[in-house]
C-alpha cells in the first residue's frame, strides 16, 4: 500500500490529526521535500545575522553577517568579528600580529613570514604585519653565467587550516 503522505508536496505536511490530508505549512515554517509529517521552523537571522534569503513554505531562510562580521561554519552558523589586516582575533578581541607574523585578511590568524633561506633565497622585500616577505633570487642565481630563467619556487603552504 502506498503511504498517503507521499502525495504531500513540498510546502505542506501530512496532517496526522486530520486523516493524513496535506495541510500547508503554517507561517514561519517550511518543508523542502514532499511526504513530510511536520514542517520545520524557519531559521531566524537575528543579532549579528542578517537575512540573505527569506524563508518560504518550501525553503529555509539563509543568513549572512552584518558588516564588521564574517560567516563561519556550514550555512553561516556563526558570525565572527572582523579584524584589520595585520591583526588576529583572540578571546580578548583583535590583537596586532606579533613580529615575524602577518595577516593580509580581515579574518583568520597571523601566519609566520616565509623563511626565504629555506629555499636558498634572499629577502627581497621585508615582511610587515600585513604582508609576507618577498623572496628574491638565490645568491647562486646572481652569479655570472647563471641561467637567466629559473623555475619559480614552489608556493609554501602556511601551517593553518583553510579559512
Amino acid at each position: 500500500l502506498q503511504d498517503p503522505c507521499s502525495n504531500c508536496p513540498a510546502g505542506t505536511f501530512c496532517d496526522n490529526n486530520r486523516n493524513q490530508i496535506c495541510s500547508p505549512c503554517p507561517p514561519n515554517s517550511f518543508s523542502s521535500a514532499g511526504g513530510q509529517r511536520t514542517c520545520d521552523i524557519c531559521r531566524q537571522c537575528k543579532g549579528v545575522f542578517r537575512t540573505r534569503k527569506e524563508c518560504s513554505s518550501t525553503s529555509n531562510a539563509e543568513c549572512d553577517c552584518t558588516p564588521g562580521f564574517h560567516c563561519l561554519g556550514a550555512g553561516c552558523s556563526m558570525c565572527e568579528q572582523d579584524c584589520k589586516q595585520g591583526q588576529e582575533l583572540t578571546k580578548k578581541g583583535c590583537k596586532d600580529c606579533c613580529f615575524g607574523t602577518f595577516n593580509d585578511q580581515k579574518r583568520g590568524i597571523c601566519r609566520p613570514w616565509t623563511n626565504c633561506s629555506l629555499d636558498g633565497k634572499s629577502v627581497l622585500v621585508n615582511g610587515t604585519k600585513e604582508r609576507d616577505v618577498v623572496c628574491g633570487p638565490s645568491p647562486a642565481d646572481l652569479s655570472p653565467g647563471a641561467s637567466s630563467v629559473t623555475p619559480p619556487a614552489p608556493a609554501r603552504e602556511p601551517g593553518h587550516s583553510p579559512q
Epitope: 496526522n16 490529526n17 503554517p26 521535500a33 513530510q36 511536520t38 520545520d40
Partner: antibody, heavy 121, light 106 residues
Framework: QVQLQQSGAELARPGASVKMSCKAS????????MHWLKQRPGQGLEWIGY????????NYNQKFTDKATLTADKSSSTAYMQLSSLTSEDSAVYYC??????????????WGTGTTVTVSS | QIVLSQSPTILSASPGEKVTMTCRAS?????IHWYQQKPGSSPKAWIS???NLASGVPARFSGSGSGTSYSLTISRVEAEDAATYYC?????????FGSGTKLEIK
Amino acid sequence: QVQLQQSGAELARPGASVKMSCKASGYTFTFYTMHWLKQRPGQGLEWIGYINPSSGYTNYNQKFTDKATLTADKSSSTAYMQLSSLTSEDSAVYYCARSDGSSSKWYFDVWGTGTTVTVSS
Amino acid sequence: QIVLSQSPTILSASPGEKVTMTCRASSSVSYIHWYQQKPGSSPKAWISATSNLASGVPARFSGSGSGTSYSLTISRVEAEDAATYYCQQWSSNPFTFGSGTKLEIK
C-alpha cells in the same frame, strides 16, 4: 504507552562536555520532533532547540548555538544532546520533550524524565 | 524574543474556590500552551492552543484568551491542583515560557 526515558545524572568539571540521551518508545520516532529544554533549580523553562529525527534538521535558540549539539539515531529511536565548555551556569535539569509537528502548534505533549547536570570543580 | 509575564507569582486558594492566573505576552501571539509541574517531577502537558485540555486533565480547568492576554481558570480548586503552571508560546522563534504561577492550597 508513549515514554521518553532520559539518561542518568551527570557530574562534570568546568570546561568539560557531557552527552545525554533520550530514548523514545511507544510511537513512531520519525513522526514527531524532539525538543530539549533547560530548567535551573527553582527557575522556569528555557527552550534549547529541536531536531526533526526524520530529516536531521535542527533549529536552536540562538542563546544555545555554541553550547548544545542535537543529534538523533533513528535505528534506536534515541535523541542526544551534547553540552560543551561547561560552566556553573549549565548546572540544571535538562528535559527532552516530544512535539506533534502535525498540529503545527509546537506543543510539548510528552516530556522526558529529566537529566540532572551538575558542574563542579 | 517574545516575553511571557505570568501573574500572580504565587496564588493561594482554599479547596472549592475559583482561581484564575494570567499570562501576558510582550507582543501578540496566536495561541498559548499551558503545562503543570509538581516539585521533583517533569512538566506535564495541560492545555494546548489556548483552550484544549490535554488527555486526563479534569474539566474544572479551562483556558481562554487572545492577542497578548491569556488565562487559565480552575472552577473549583482541589488539593491535587497544587503545582506550578507555566505558559508557553511559539508565534515567534525562539519558544518562550512564562516564569510560572505557583498554586498553593490552604
